[in-house]
């Protein structure tokens, strides 16, 4: 049994880091493998992650972490029984994939303005809370070409757009994702999408 693709990990910079790797053949990850991880710090204890299958030879493990900060560094040991298959390290702050924003809501009761709001996925005491920027994706269910991205570079988790910038009388969907420049993160996953019917009063023409 050998590791074909070494583990690569990403952290949500809050409580979970996800590591993925590939073995050189079909593997029952949960019964055959264990990923041990330990913070390089006074008093830290070794923790064991039981991996799940991710395709025939692929494995994925969700590492639980407390109080993740930039100084943290973890040692990783991948074991198959008594055999050490791979040894490495992981610094969560250097491999951040933010959590997806939640509670995306479209408020259509503001005069001819669409107000989209969502929730910041981090608590106020987390460093990322004040450092997320967002991308809002709006698309038409009727017209695949009607697909647009709005970059929200301010901190407030909201976006206002004129309803007239979208076509009237048809349904739209929206979703939002986040990233943080300070840690050069990847983009988060998209939030679940929300749907609304876009209608507005056409301006009266003489």
């Amino acid at each position: 049994m050998k590791v074909l693709q070494e583990p690569t990990c990403v952290s949500d910079y809050m409580s979970i880091s996800t590591c993925e790797w590939k073995m050189n053949g079909p593997t029952n990850c949960s019964t055959e493998l264990r990923l041990l991880y330990q913070l390089v710090f006074l008093l830290s204890e070794a923790h064991t992650c039981i991996p799940e299958n991710n395709g025939g030879a692929g494995c994925v493990c969700h590492l639980l972490m407390d109080d993740v900060v930039s100084a943290d560094n973890y040692t990783l040991d991948l074991w198959a029984g008594q055999q050490l298959l791979w040894k490495g390290s992981f610094k969560p702050s250097e491999h951040v994939k933010p959590r997806a924003p939640g509670n995306l809501t479209v408020h259509t009761n503001v005069s001819d303005t669409l107000l989209l709001t969502w929730s910041n996925p981090y608590p106020p005491d987390n460093y990322l809370y004040n450092h997320l920027t967002y991308a809002v994706n709006i698309w038409s269910e009727n017209d695949p070409a009607d697909f647009r991205i709005y970059n929200v570079t301010y901190l407030e988790p909201s976006l206002r757009i004129a309803a007239s910038t979208l076509k009237s009388g048809i349904s739209y969907r929206a979703r939002v994702r986040a990233w943080a420049q300070c840690y050069n993160t990847t983009w988060s996953e998209w939030s679940p999408s929300t749907k609304w019917h876009n209608s507005y009063r056409e301006p009266f023409e003489q």
């Epitope: 710090f41 008093l43 204890e45 900060v69």
Partner: antibody, heavy 116, light 111 residues
Amino acid sequence: QVQLVQSGAEVKKPGASVKVSCKASGYAFTSYYMHWARQAPGQGLEWMGIINPSGGSTSYAQKFQGRVTMTRDTSTSTVYMELSSLRSEDTAVYYCARGKWWFYDWGKGTLVTVSS
Amino acid sequence: QSVLTQPPSVSAAPGQKVTISCSGGSSNIGNSYVSWYQQLPGTAPKLLIYDNNKRPSGIPDRFSGSKSGTSATLAITGLQTGDEADYYCGTWDTSTTMYPLFGTGTKLTVL
């Protein structure tokens, strides 16, 4: 919000022991390390040791080895610092502080006076 | 005796900028992260800067931190009378066993 509430001031005789408590609230108690530091009158800060509330493991500054004991009670979210064989130089304000590499939140401090 | 050296005192007038240095070595500041604490008279220390240059929420951007090699600096701009306090740097010693270190402390006087 996070609160670290420490026990009240103590006056002790040389050779005695003192036990200071620090009750935590407003966060997951077992998810954050707790440090103890002290500050003698008019002096700087001095680190004493650390406890992991999750398992109860401890590490102490070499200067206090053998004289200090840190414990925790997860049922009351409280950590304790006991210092024995007190001498006059131990007169100081003792602080608990939550954190790992740095100290996010501090208790208000407990003044321990050692005097004959 | 702390191995992190700070000037015993600094002073400046309201509205001015002041810097406080913290000098260490390769086994502490040079190989670890720096934090800064403010201790107002008669109160407990308070975290001002962590991870060399990050501010906890609620700390105004008048306070900033930097690190270069084996020394670190705290800068305070737009000085206010309420900033008069003792300031301590902190880091970790990584030579043999890891343990936290505090600087000698600096008394800031706002003239």
